[in-house]
Amino acid sequence: CKAMHVAQPAVVLASSRGIASFVCEYASPGKATEVRVTVLRQADSQVTEVCAATYMMGNELTFLDDSICTGTSSGNQVNLTIQGLRAMDTGLYICKVELMYPPPYYLGIGNGTQIYVIDPEPCPDSDF
C-alpha cells in the first residue's frame, strides 16, 4: 500500500502551444503548514525531475524563475501547468507530494498523468 494518497488525472492533452495543465490532489493526514510538490517525468524506466516547489499553506507556489512549471494551490489541491512542451516530451508525469512541516513527514506519489504533446503542423507557405 502506498503512503499518503495522491490523485491526478490519467490523461491530459497539451494545447497546440505546448501547454498542459492538471490538478494534483492529496489527502492530508494532518495539518501541514509546509508542503513540497515535485513533478517527475517517467520515460522508459528513467525518472527525471521536471520541477519542484515548496509552499506554505495559504500561500502561492513559487517555482524557480527558469522553471517550465507554474502553479496555484487551494487547500489540498495543486493546479500545475507545464509549458514549452514538444512532441518528444510526451510521457508520464508523476506528482509527488511531501508534507514537510510540522512533523511527522508524509510522502505520497500519484499514479501519473500521461501527457500527450503533438507538435503543430507548420503553416503552409503563401504565394503572393
Partner: antibody, heavy 115, light 107 residues
C-alpha cells in the same frame, strides 16, 4: 516535550498472547499514523504494524510475519495505541517501539518468548 | 515488497574523518527514504527524512543524498559521539522495510 511510553512487555510462553500499550503526549496524536517497530539482534529493526488516523479511516497494515496474529488499534481520546499479539513465537522476541509517524519513538518494551 | 540493502555492515573510522553509508532499494522509492541513528541501549532517532532533510535537533554534520534506488548518508568530521548503528528505511510503501544496519565504530 514529546513522550511515548510503552508498557505490557514481559516473559510469555510460545503460543500465548500479550498486549502492548503506548501512551503519547507532547504532539498532536490524532494527526499521526502510529506504528510498532521491533528490534532484535538477529533482524535489526523491523516494522511490525501501522494504524492510520481518522482522515484515512483508521486503516491498518501489518508485516507478513505478524499478519493474522497481531492487531493494532488506537484510542485518540486517550492518545494511546495498542498491539494485541496472539500465538506468540520465539521469532517475535525483541524490543517493541511505538512510533508517531517515524519521527517520535518511545523507549521500548521488551517481549521475551520462552517456555 | 521493497528490499533495502545497506552497506557496509560495519565501519571503523578516526575522529575528524568523513564516512559514507549507502542504501539501495530493490525498486524506485522516489526519495521516500529515512535514516536513523541508534545508540547502544537507546531508542532509534530520526536523522534524515525524505532522503535529504535533516531532522530537528540533529547535527548538520549529517547529510543525506540520492534518488530513485540509490541513497547515501554522509557523516562529516566524525565525533566520538557518532558511535551508533545507522539504518535506512523505505517510507514510500508498506511494508516499511529497513536496511540491515551499519555499525559505526571509532578507531
Amino acid at each position: 516535550e514529546v513522550k511515548l511510553d510503552e508498557t505490557g512487555g514481559g516473559l510469555v510462553q510460545p503460543g500465548r498472547p500479550i498486549k502492548l500499550s503506548c501512551v503519547a503526549s507532547g504532539f498532536t496524536f490524532s494527526d499521526n499514523w502510529m506504528n510498532w517497530v521491533r528490534q532484535s539482534p538477529e533482524k535489526g529493526l523491523e516494522w511490525v504494524a501501522q494504524i492510520r488516523n481518522k482522515p484515512y479511516n483508521y486503516e491498518t497494515y501489518y508485516s507478513d510475519s505478524v499478519k493474522g496474529r497481531f492487531t493494532i488499534s488506537r484510542d485518540d481520546s486517550k492518545s494511546s495505541v495498542y498491539l494485541q499479539m496472539n500465538n506468540l513465537r520465539t521469532k517475535d522476541m525483541g524490543i517493541y517501539y511505538c512510533t508517531g509517524g517515524f519521527t517520535y519513538w518511545g523507549q521500548g518494551t521488551l517481549v521475551t518468548v520462552s517456555a | 515488497d521493497i528490499q533495502m540493502t545497506q552497506s557496509p555492515p560495519s565501519l571503523s573510522a578516526s575522529v575528524g574523518e568523513t564516512v559514507t553509508i549507502t542504501c539501495g532499494a530493490s525498486e524506485n522509492i522516489y526519495g521516500g527514504l529515512n535514516w536513523y541513528q541508534r545508540k547502544q541501549g537507546k531508542s532509534p532517532q530520526l536523522l534524515i527524512y525524505g532522503a535529504t532533510n535533516l531532522a530537528d535537533g540533529m547535527s548538520s554534520r549529517f547529510s543525506g543524498s540520492g534518488s530513485g534506488r540509490q541513497y547515501s548518508l554522509k557523516i562529516s568530521r566524525l565525533h566520538p559521539d557518532d558511535v551508533a548503528t545507522y539504518y535506512c528505511q523505505n517510507v514510500l510503501n508498506t511494508p516499511y522495510t529497513f536496511g540491515g544496519g551499519t555499525k559505526l565504530e571509532i578507531k
